[in-house]
Amino acid sequence: MKVLQEPTCVSDYMSISTCEWKMNGPTNCSTELRLLYQLVFLLSEAHTCIPENNGGAGCVCHLLMDDVVSADNYTLDLWAGQQLLWKGSFKPSEHVKPRAPGNLTVHTNVSDTLLLTWSNPYPPDNYLYNHLTYAVNIWSENDPADFRIYNVTYREPSLRIAASTLKSGISYRARVRAWAQCYNTTWSEWSPSTKWHNSYREPFEQH
């Protein structure tokens, strides 16, 4: 039994890091493998993660972590019974994938303006709370070509757009994701999408 693709891990910079790897053949990850992880400091405890299957030869492990700080560094040991298959280390602050924003709401009752709001996925004491920027994806359910991305580079979890920038009388969906430039993070997963019917008063045209 050998590791084909070494574990790569990402942290939500709060409570979970997720590690994925591939074995050289079909593996029952939960019965055959264990990933041990330990914070590098004196008297720290070793924790054991039971991996789950992620495709035939793929495994995934969710590592529970206490509040992450930038100095945290973990040793990782992948075992198959008594055999050490791989040894490595992981610094959560250097491999961050933020949590997805939540509670995306489209407010359509503001005169011909669409106000999209969502919630920051971090509590105020978390370092990422004040460092997230967002991308909002809006698309038409009727027309696959009507697909747009708005970059929200300010900290406020909201976006205002004129309803007239979208077609009237059709349904749209929106979703939002986050990233933090300060930690050079990857993008978060997209939030669940929300749907609304876009309608606004067409301006009276004189001929």
């Epitope: 979970i16 914070l39 992450v68």
Partner: antibody, heavy 115, light 107 residues
Amino acid sequence: QVQLVESGGGLVQPGGSLRLSCVASGFTFSHSSMNWVRQAPGKGLEWVSYISRATGAVYYADSVKGRFTISRDNAKNSLYLQMNSLRDEDTAVYYCAREPVFDYWGQGTLVTVSS
Amino acid sequence: DIQMTQSPSAMSASVGDRVTITCRASQDISNYLAWFQQKPGKVPTRLIYAASSLQSGVPSRFSGSGSGTEFTLTISSLQPEDFATYYCLQWSSYPRTFGQGTKVEIK
């Protein structure tokens, strides 16, 4: 091995105060965020409060906000819960529980609020 | 605040039965969900975290699934020592909230 031992429970009248303690051993307390969780007699679990190892930030359940204060003394390996303006509905066994996500619990201390 | 609704609140089952307990969150919590077991007079112990990750030392007959707002704890073949109360917990945001509990009793 990890051990959490709560103390300070007892009988108190409505409107009174009590201070619970939780002494930790078997791990580096200063590196762990901590929680208080309670359970009223015959009822379910209710999260009460949290204190971060990283920032010292604190969070509370709405039911205790403004009345309870969580704190810690890393030099004494101790977690505290100062409970003021106690009500009948605060009667419960109070547990301290370690992060991440309540991996270890103490045995609990019973707080009875009654006149 | 996020509400966690567990069902059923109580159930009777026999040794060897397959038992399923569900937990519904009032809003999306991704996979930030854990399951705990509590036996009478004892302290709760964590069975599952991150919705589907089995806690080390917990028998493999316990499994968890779900994401977003719908979650399930399954006991594939109920054993005598599994008669207890089970709680779900969301730790997606503060305040953290538990489900009201499911008591699994002997039929």
